[in-house]
């Protein structure tokens, strides 16, 4: 059976397509090609008489067609109007006709797309943004990329208009992008330049750094305030409720105890109209803001119950500190046998009993800081009594 095949089936605009003929009868008188699904002289492309090798162009001939002796038809520089069906009619030598119909599809070489947006400066949690991939072309697949990744599944992302429009519902600051759209058809693909969103947000609750609360007199107090915000926040400082300055940094040299108080950072975003504040307490004191870790020592760690005594000592180089003791998470002393001495640096247990076995540690502290020692384990043994022979004479 006579058949035709398009090579290729999907053709890029401007390229060429060959309508190949299979199972062409051996003895032919002539053949004709037609645009469409039937023999129609109004749509004849070319008629070809084998014997005379004479080609007669028809009304559908554009000058871009070449017919070959094997009945194949080459169409060059194809346009989208060339898309469709093509019918070959062959006149066999016995004057019997045969027909075959084939088709191909012409697709444009796609241009570089671009992204248009209905709102390039949306406000976080308030605005929606619709991106549209331009241009609109027929037989085209539209794809979207965010941060070079295909679209995540999200209820805030909606595709419409044949995937040509991407809508972000209730934008967040993480939706800045970049966004790219890609257009595809069977013969070409092209991706837009990236587009980023300028999401207006904030300010968030400010953070004051450093986090230190305690300062020694004579030190410099340097505080910095930061609140996530777009556009960047405008900052101002208040001390004990009194406005100081409109800067992000607050610097007070050579502080005294009089500089103790509440320090407020005020962040403002003029676009969103939102304000946020954070209050930090600053204490200026001679006391060490950081107490070093104390060391704990025992006169012995393994003792005999009801016989031995033991001394535990807590050592620290810090001054102006207090010491307290803990045993099994309980504060000591917890019995008459436990005594504290030398400003609580020494814990004496006399005599040691079985219930005194376990973990001990000490803690040093001042009004603004504290630190614990590593734990120490006290083991309590009891000597075994010699057994008497209780056997009666036999």
């Amino acid at each position: 059976q006579l058949t035709t095949e398009s090579m290729p089936f999907n053709v890029a605009e401007g390229k060429e397509v060959l309508l190949l003929v299979h199972n062409l009868p051996q003895q032919l008188f002539g053949y004709s090609w037609y645009k469409g699904e039937r023999v129609d002289g109004n749509r004849q492309i070319v008629g070809y008489a084998i014997g005379t090798q004479q080609a007669t162009p028809g009304p559908a001939n554009s000058g871009r067609e070449t017919i070959y002796p094997n009945a194949s038809l080459l169409i060059q520089n194809v346009t989208q109007n060339d898309t469709g069906f093509y019918t070959l009619q062959v006149i066999k030598s016995d004057l019997v006709n045969e027909e075959a119909t084939g088709q191909f599809h012409v697709y444009p070489e796609l241009p570089k797309p671009s992204i248009s947006s209905n709102n390039s400066n949306p406000v976080e949690d308030k605005d929606a943004v619709a991106f549209t991939c331009e241009p609109e072309t027929q037989d085209t697949t539209y794809l979207w990329w965010i941060n070079n990744q295909s679209l995540p599944v999200s209820p805030r992302l909606q595709l419409s208009n044949g995937n040509r429009t991407l809508t972000l519902l209730s934008v967040t600051r993480n939706d800045t992008g970049p966004y790219e759209c890609e257009i595809q058809n069977p013969v070409s693909a092209n991706r837009s330049d990236p587009v980023t969103l300028n999401v207006t947000y904030g300010p968030d609750t400010p953070t004051i750094s450093p986090s230190d609360t305690y300062y020694r007199p004579g030190a410099n107090l340097s505080l910095s305030c930061y609140a996530a915000s777009n556009p960047p926040a405008q900052y101002s400082w208040l001390i004990n409720g009194t406005f100081q300055q409109s800067t992000q940094e607050l610097f007070i040299p050579n502080i005294t105890v009089n500089n103790s108080g509440s320090y407020t950072c005020h962040a403002n975003n003029s676009v969103t109209g939102c304000n946020r504040t954070t209050v930090k307490t600053i204490i200026v004191t001679e006391l060490s803001p950081v107490v070093a870790k104390p060391q704990i020592k025992a006169s012995k760690t393994t003792v005999t119950g009801d016989k031995d005594s033991v001394n535990l000592t807590c050592s620290t180089n810090d001054t102006g500190i207090s010491i307290r003791w803990f045993f099994k998470n309980q504060s000591l002393p917890s019995s008459e046998r436990m005594k504290l001495s030398q400003g609580n640096t020494t814990l004496s247990i006399n005599p040691v009993k079985r219930e005194d076995a376990g973990t001990y540690w000490c803690e040093v502290f001042n009004p603004i800081s504290k630190n614990q020692s590593d734990p120490i384990m006290l083991n309590v043994n009891y000597n075994a009594l010699p057994q008497e022979n209780g056997l009666s004479p036999g």
Epitope: Q27, S32, G41, Q44, I91, K92, L95
Partner: antibody
Amino acid sequence: QVQLQQSGAELVRPGTSVKVSCKASGYAFTIYLIEWVKQRPGQGLEWIGVINPGSGGTNYNEKFKGKATLTADKSSSTAFMQLSSLTSDDSAVYFCARSYYYGSFAMDYWGQGTSVTVSQ
Amino acid sequence: DVQMTQTISSLSASLGDRVTISCRASQDIGNYLNWYQQKPDGTVKLLIYYTSRLHSGVPSRFSGSGSGTDYSLTISNLEQEDIATYFCQQGNTLRTFGGGTKLEIK
């Protein structure tokens, strides 16, 4: 130049047969078709059939199947039409014509015609 | 089968006239229409094929047009030698002729 020379006029009895010839010259005989056309006195043209001299393939008007038989002799570049079982209805001038293909068919050169008279 | 009809069987015209002869097909023949001239001596010539294409050697005063089922032959400047009968013919697998239009001088 292209010429189609037909045989002379025929006077024949009813019920007999007649064979009209058409000798082609001035072109390659086997690469065109030969068509046969009937014209009764004072009437229009009526297509009888066509032959491909290169292959002997034929196509007939349904009305003339069994009446006309088309043949061709490549060696003498001559086409023939035999009409059988003649009646007075067969009295006419018969033309042969060369036909070429352009997607359809057109008869571009014609013979001078052969008059066949069927009479007692 | 496709029937071809030439409704005007004869017409008279003066030399120099523009003459149009019409032909109708019983169905769309897709421009596969030919025109023939038969002189009074019986000789037949192809004038136009494929509706509007002039056969070689035919004077340019002859032209053809039409589409679908309606076709026409026009002689733009009638000459004495154009006195003849004109036949249309559809050129599909089974050819058929119109009844003819006889052109005479007034």
